[in-house]
């Protein structure tokens, strides 16, 4: 049982545990999200991602969540149960990122570039919101990210 992001395989992470951690904080996060018109993980970011692209894209998205979203939100959260759930999500994201080794070969340039352009769409949408709103929205959209990632899980 493992994720297969194209040539990149990830062991030891179970989708159910990610969802359970997300649900533990979902109501809190999405209740605070007042901007319902905008979406960060829009269709163009995650739709029709090829297997080869998926390794690059999931790597950049999860790194962004770890370095920008979880890190900043962690400093703003005091509720122990919420922190525990964030930690579960973050630890699993770390485990995934640590196993992803996207190829840096020249012949993969166009695939890498395509994945990067998808990521830039997400980051641009994130930067258009003020920091607090962007963090809340990014956390509220973890379900969109998990739904997409789940497509690459193989038993």
């Amino acid at each position: 049982q493992e994720f297969h992001f194209g040539p990149c395989q990830v062991k030891g992470v179970v989708p159910q545990k990610l969802w359970e951690a997300f649900w533990a904080v979902k109501d809190t996060m999405q209740a605070q999200d007042n901007i319902t018109s905008a979406r960060l993980l829009q269709q163009e970011v995650l739709q029709n991602v090829s297997d080869a692209e998926s390794c690059y894209l999931v790597h950049t998205l999860l790194e962004f969540y770890l370095k920008t979203v979880f890190k900043n939100y962690h400093n703003r959260t005091v509720e122990v149960r919420t922190l525990k759930s964030f930690s579960t999500l973050a630890n699993n994201f770390v485990l995934i990122v640590s196993q992803l080794q996207p190829s840096q070969e020249n012949e993969m340039f166009s695939i890498r570039d395509s994945a990067h352009r998808r990521f830039l769409l997400f980051r641009r949408a994130f930067k258009q919101l003020d920091v607090e709103a962007a963090l809340t929205k990014a956390l509220g959209e973890v379900d969109i990210l998990l739904t997409w990632m789940q497509k690459f899980y193989k038993l």
Epitope: W23, Q150, K151, Y153
Partner: antibody
Framework: ELQLVESGGGSVQPGGSLRLSCAAS????????MYWVRQAPGKGLEWLSL????????FYADSVKGRFTISRDNAKNTLYLQMNSLKSEDTAVYYC????????????WGQGTQVTVSA | SYELTQSPSVSVAQRQTAKITCGGD??????AQWYQQKPGQAPVMVIY???RRPSGIPERFSGSNSGNTATLTISGAQAEDEADYYC???????????FGGGTHLTVL
């Protein structure tokens, strides 16, 4: 061999209650999400409820929210569905199902138990 | 609420290819599952995560999912494939498992 066996079905009057059970064997019950799905006579499949591994999260279809309650006893390897305020439109075959392991994928099903709600 | 739309019936000649479709708003971003149900029996999963086959399911069953349509393909349909087929996905905004209305496959 993996087995899911439903029981507790039967006939009941409108407004009445029933408790369905699903006895699981052949796998580590506590590691999997479980579901209840029903099928009215001549109709399609209708999802009713989902419960996570430890019962920490439960979800329901709008049609049964507030009337049905899903629960599990991991020590007894058993899934339950408490059905209250039953209506004639609840008449159906009720199936329990086990997640495949990838999430939201109903990989194994019981044979079902018939519930008839009629005056 | 999220809806999955299937045509009620599809016919295919034996040993020909059958395609059963499932329409849903941006279903390509979700994981699609397919179930086979024969009369008087419980459903059986034939495809999960868009295109993956559970063990024991014949290779003639395959799946794809893109845009607004998920497709179940049966290459070289056999008489025993005659059944009802249901697609299914998870609607994360409503926290609900959603089934399509079902398609009856007739193998001529």
């Amino acid at each position: 061999e993996l087995q899911l066996v439903e029981s507790g079905g039967g006939s009941v009057q409108p407004g009445g209650s029933l408790r369905l059970s699903c006895a699981a064997s052949g796998f580590t019950f506590s590691n999997y999400w479980m579901y209840w799905v029903r099928q009215a006579p001549g109709k399609g499949l209708e999802w009713l409820s989902l419960i996570t591994t430890d019962g920490g999260s439960t979800f329901y279809a709008d049609s049964v929210k507030g009337r049905f309650t899903i629960s599990r006893d991991n020590a007894k390897n058993t899934l339950y569905l408490q059905m209250n305020s039953l209506k004639s439109e609840d008449t159906a075959v009720y199936y329990c199902a086990k997640d495949l392991g990838s999430g939201f994928s109903l990989g194994s099903w019981g044979q079902g138990t018939q519930v008839t709600v009629s005056a | 609420s999220y809806e999955l739309t299937q045509s009620p019936s599809v016919s295919v000649a034996q040993r020909q290819t059958a395609k059963i479709t499932c329409g849903g708003d941006n279903i390509g971003s979700k994981s699609a599952q397919w179930y086979q149900q024969k009369p008087g029996q419980a459903p059986v999963m034939v495809i999960y995560s868009d295109s993956r086959r559970p063990s024991g399911i014949p290779e003639r069953f395959s799946g794809s999912n893109s845009g607004n349509t998920a497709t179940l393909t049966i290459s070289g349909a056999q008489a025993e494939d005659e059944a009802d087929y249901y697609c299914q996905a998870w609607d994360s905004s409503a926290n609900a498992v959603v089934f399509g209305g079902g398609t009856h496959l007739t193998v001529l």
